[in-house]
């Protein structure tokens, strides 16, 4: 017969002859025969492949490194690489979670619209009027003004996005 | 079909050094291990180490670690072991094979250690 | 001392079967579907009869199959031959690019 010239999905062409890719998790060790299959053997300890290969390394897993802050999310497998998240108050800086910098404070006049994760940054907002925060803070939000009416009490300063609203007494009225 | 010849029989004095060669013929070079196993006279087969089939990467057996070096060339399809500091109970046959399945041996080659 | 353990012999009479087992550990036979089997006859080279636990090389009988069960493989030579005779060695790959043999075993055919 002639030898193929294409062969199907998880086979590779070698020696005029197609041969079975190994599976993820293992690595190529020595091409099929005409006798024998595919020679394949599992990734060692701490590495992995993802994908039907011909690799005749596996990858090393992702190291955690902690003096950059990270620490692992879920640990790899022979198939799957580890996954690095963020030590708390910590985020990555990249989408491949190579290193961590600090949690962003929102400043006074600023409220926290969305709190960080592990791979994202905290998102500060500005207070809208009726609001204000006057901390610098990761966690906290812009807390509504005051309302003095519902303490019968009348606005004495008015607030800003930085302070609240300061509330005193009613004034009586003169006879 | 993949061949693997060896280089002929040797005989060494104790201390000295020993290089087997087991040149590969059909196939492709780089895309397969080769293993190396000796059998010392009357005695069982003993996995020596193995060189990997791209990069030259080798894994030894702890009992030759430090003693045995697997090396390949590729200019001339060919892997080479060497094993030093020689003692008597060396004296074995030397077969290279393909892979650690070891599908193909070569014919095996007889290094014999005395003084 | 090898690191996987055969009996020294076997034996049986032409057209019986004969099994031969070959323990190791759980870090090598069971740790892995890996092992193969050799057939070796005097002054010759071993020649691959089975490999990943119970797979044939075209070109070997069925006459040849195997077995695995936890940290112990099995070879059974079934309608046994004159030309059976021979010493037959199993292997493990044990992790971290390392394989290991049995001893061996002197088949004889009565």
């Known amino acids: 017969p002639e030898p193929p010239t294409a062969c199907r999905e998880k086979q590779y062409l070698i020696n005029s002859q197609c041969c079975s890719l190994c599976q993820p998790g293992q690595k190529l060790v020595s091409d099929c025969t005409e006798f024998t299959e595919t020679e394949c053997l599992p990734c060692g300890e701490s590495e992995f492949l993802d994908t039907w290969n011909r690799e005749t390394h596996c990858h090393q897993h992702k190291y955690c490194d902690p003096n950059l802050g990270l620490r692992v999310q879920q640990k790899g497998t022979s198939e799957t690489d580890t996954i690095c998240t963020c030590e708390e108050g910590w985020h990555c800086t990249s989408e491949a979670c190579e290193s961590c910098v600090l949690h962003r404070s929102c400043s006074p006049g600023f409220g926290v619209k969305q709190i960080a994760t592990g791979v994202s940054d905290t998102i500060c907002e500005p207070c809208p009027v009726g609001f204000f925060s006057n901390v610098s803070s990761a966690f906290e939000k812009c807390h509504p003004w005051t309302s003095c009416e519902t303490k019968d009490l009348v606005v004495q300063q008015a607030g800003t996005n930085k302070t609240d609203v300061v509330c005193g007494p009613q004034d009586r009225l003169r006879a | 079909q993949v061949q693997l010849v060896q280089s002929g029989a040797e005989v060494k004095k104790p201390g000295s050094s020993v290089k087997v060669s087991c040149k590969a013929s059909g196939g492709t070079f780089s895309s397969y291990a080769i293993s190396w196993v000796r059998q010392a006279p009357g005695q069982g087969l003993e996995w020596m180490g193995m060189i990997n089939p791209s990069g030259g990467t080798t894994s030894y057996a702890q009992k030759f670690q430090g003693r045995v070096t697997m090396t390949r060339d590729t200019s001339t399809s060919t892997v080479y072991m060497e094993l030093s500091s020689l003692r008597p109970e060396d004296t074995a046959v030397y077969y290279c094979a393909r892979g650690f399945r070891m599908d193909q041996w070569g014919q095996g080659t007889l290094v014999t250690v005395s003084s | 001392q090898s690191a996987l353990t055969q009996p020294p012999s076997a034996s049986g009479s032409p057209g019986q079967s004969v099994t031969i087992s070959c323990t190791g550990t759980?870090?090598?036979?069971?740790?892995?579907?890996?092992v193969s089997w050799y057939q070796q006859h005097p002054g010759n080279a071993p020649k691959l009869i089975i490999y990943?636990?119970?797979k044939r090389p075209s070109g070997i009988p069925d006459r040849f199959s195997a077995s695995k069960s936890g940290n112990t493989a099995s070879l059974t030579v079934s309608g046994l031959q004159a030309d059976d005779e021979a010493d037959y060695y199993c292997?493990?790959?044990?992790?971290?690019?390392?394989?290991?043999f049995g001893g061996g075993t002197k088949l004889t055919v009565l």
């Open positions: 759980s870090s090598d036979v069971g740790a892995y579907n890996f």
């Open positions: 990943d636990v119970r």
């Open positions: 292997s493990s790959y044990a992790g971290n690019n390392r394989l290991v």
